[in-house]
Amino acid sequence: APTSSSTKKTQLQLEHLLLDLQMILNGINNYKNPKLTRMLTFKFYMPKKATELKHLQCLEEELKPLEEVLNLAQSKNFHLRPRDLISNINVIVLELKGSETTFMCEYADETATIVEFLNRWITFCQSIISTLT
């Protein structure tokens, strides 16, 4: 059973992941972003199911494509290089999903835009945080 301190750590990491993903979404959605139309042409794989921490494997596998799209944006809204931003997210994701079990990610048939992709994972974080006690 998870201890109080491990739950608190998980909550904290999920909150940081949530803030980082929302930061990216806000940055690319910014009305001053001239590259948004181009960015929306890139397709991202969505998880068939995302209800547990192990499903973060699906996010991890899409972080490289995410970094490539953010490189295109070159947005000043991030205050960090995309490489550093994605590196921070990767560290959190690895800690959250753990490395004890290998999970094969199943993807949905339909791909998504970067905005839909980020919104999906933001909702995932919100949902998991809301179940922590």
Epitope: H16, H79, Q126, I129, S130
Partner: antibody
Amino acid sequence: QVQLVQSGAEVKKPGASVKVSCKASGYTFTGYYMHWVRQAPGQGLEWMGWINPNSGGTNYAQKFQGRVTMTRDTSISTAYMELSRLRSDDTAVYYCARDLTFDYWGQGTLVTVSS
Amino acid sequence: AIQLTQSPSSLSASVGDRVTITCQASQDIFNLLNWYRQKPGKAPDLLVYRASNLETGVPSRFSGSGSGTDFTFTISSLQPEDVGTYYCQQSANLPLTFGGGTKVEIK
């Protein structure tokens, strides 16, 4: 015990800048994001943005974009919030607060903008 | 931005009374809502996090409930030291937003 201690009150002229500090103790500074919240006299609370002390990454509320800069010095466990091009309606108490649930707050720093 | 509508904006009650404050979000925020009390001249204090979890050290007369868009904060038996302004705050979406506050006074 966790403590967030802020710098003292400031009086500034319109158009000037102010830099408020928030020194953290009693926990691992780089393990928690730091938020800044302000409160104008007799008004409610307004979120300004956050900084990740580990990476230096920041995110600002759109209202403050271009005027606010949040930085940190991990060697002294201190976060900073600088607000530029001050106007009279920036007169407020500025608070630092720890992470998304704002479980710990600084005591507040009164910034008065007056000509 | 998510708007939080808090009511009432002020109330006056007697010691021992049950006091209820509501907070309505403009969109679904799961249970990602926190409650704070701010005493005059002081920083806010966290009382309840994630809608219903009592912060360590906070008296059990305080409680919170709700999820989605409708939330309630209750003081089961009002005490003199409970005077102050109470705020709800959502932590689901950026920008983080606060309710307008409820000023609680003793009759």
